[in-house]
């Protein structure tokens, strides 16, 4: 037997203040024995990678032995709920999303590892995991509290060819600058090395006298 029931409105409870403790006791003790709603757990926050990929685990507490499970990812943003992707799988088998789906996933027992790809900053929002136990009956439905996925667009990378051109231009500029600098430096050095006295040669004595011979300095006149 499937599970469903209603609780009396607060305003109506005031009309029968004598009976409300019994009603409350009924809901607290009697109903949970016969009925366990399916709880779905998922992380509160996930940050998408720089490549726009976000992964999170969706775990459900199955009240029965389900063989066929349907998992749906909903997105809530700007007062709108949209279906991102959905997959039905047999327990023990892999999740199969549609070929054009942005979702992929794997299942392990009562856990579903979901991956959403191709996300951009504008896709930031609350991603809700909805789990339905399709077979065997009864049908059970559980909806998680949602995972807030934050997507930050990376800084746009310039074209690689453009980068190469910049690199080539900078290195060429540096090369020509260093070449020019070297040329200027060499020309200055050569100018500094020009002789001060033209046509005069002075023979200097050796530092250590050889065989007591002494040489007098002499001049060679230039005609």
């Amino acid at each position: 037997m499937a599970c469903l029931g209603f609780q009396r409105h607060k305003a109506q409870l005031n009309l029968a203040t004598r009976t409300w403790p019994c009603t409350l006791l009924f809901f607290l003790l009697f109903i949970p024995v016969f009925c366990k709603a399916m709880h779905v757990a998922q992380p509160a926050v996930v940050l998408a990678s720089s490549r726009g990929i976000a992964s999170f685990v969706c775990e459900y507490a199955s009240p029965g032995k389900a063989t066929e499970v349907r998992v749906t990812v909903l997105r809530q943003a700007d007062s709108q709920v949209t279906e991102v992707c959905a997959a039905t799988y047999m327990m023990g088998n892999e999740l199969t999303f549609l070929d054009d789906s942005i979702c992929t996933g794997t299942s392990s027992g009562n856990q579903v590892n979901l991956t959403i790809q191709g996300l951009r900053a504008m896709d930031t929002g609350l991603y809700i995991c909805k789990v339905e136990l399709m077979y065997p009956p009864p049908y059970y439905l559980g909806i998680g509290n949602g995972t807030q996925i934050y997507v930050i667009d990376p800084e746009p990378c310039p074209d690689s060819d453009f980068l190469l051109w910049i690199l080539a231009a900078v290195s060429s500029g540096l090369f020509f600058y260093s070449f020019l600098l070297t040329a200027v430096s060499l020309s200055k050095m050569l100018k500094k090395r020009s002789p001060l006295t033209t046509g005069v040669y002075v023979k200097m004595p050796p530092t250590e006298p050889e065989c007591e011979k002494q040489f007098q300095p002499y001049f060679i006149p230039i005609n």
């Epitope: 037997m1 599970c3 399916m38 709920v81 998680g144």
Partner: nanobody, 130 residues
Framework: QIQLVESGGGSVQAGGSLRLSCAAS????????MAWFRQAPGKEREGVAT???????RYADSVKGRFTISTDSAKNTLYLQMNSLEPEDTAMYYC????????????????????????WGQGTQVTVSS
């Protein structure tokens, strides 16, 4: 399998009243959200009124002060009392139950909120003539 059966719809003159009922076939856990949705021809389904597990209610701006959502746990029934009906209220009215009360209040003024509700009735037609 949970079954929701609506009744109480019909044709009424503008300014008149109707009371919609939604009978449930079984009980559920304490955590849930009950709602009334409506869908006019050629329009999207919209949330009219919701009731949380603790009895908190919320209404669409267009029906505030005119419609009242309530329950009777003894009869396991959800109600929608509609007063001062207008021709714009003409639509198919659906009763729905969702498993997570977190989205109960958001079901109003949120497009696509029907995704949060897994159990639906077959609907009852309400026609308001001027």
């Amino acid at each position: 399998q949970i079954q929701l059966v609506e009744s109480g719809g019909g044709s009424v003159q503008a300014g008149g009243s109707l009371r919609l009922s939604c009978a449930a076939s079984a009980y559920t856990d304490r955590r849930y959200c009950m709602a009334w949705f409506r869908q006019a021809p050629g329009k999207e389904r919209e949330g009219v009124a919701t009731m949380d597990t603790d009895g908190s209610t919320r209404y669409a701006d267009s029906v505030k002060g005119r419609f009242t959502i309530s329950t009777d746990s003894a009869k396991n029934t959800l109600y929608l009392q509609m007063n001062s009906l207008e021709p714009e209220d003409t639509a198919m009215y659906y009763c729905a139950v969702g498993p997570n009360p977190r989205y109960c209040s958001g079901a109003i003024n949120t497009r696509g909120a029907e995704h949060y509700f897994g159990y639906w009735g077959q609907g009852t037609q309400v026609t308001v003539s001027s």
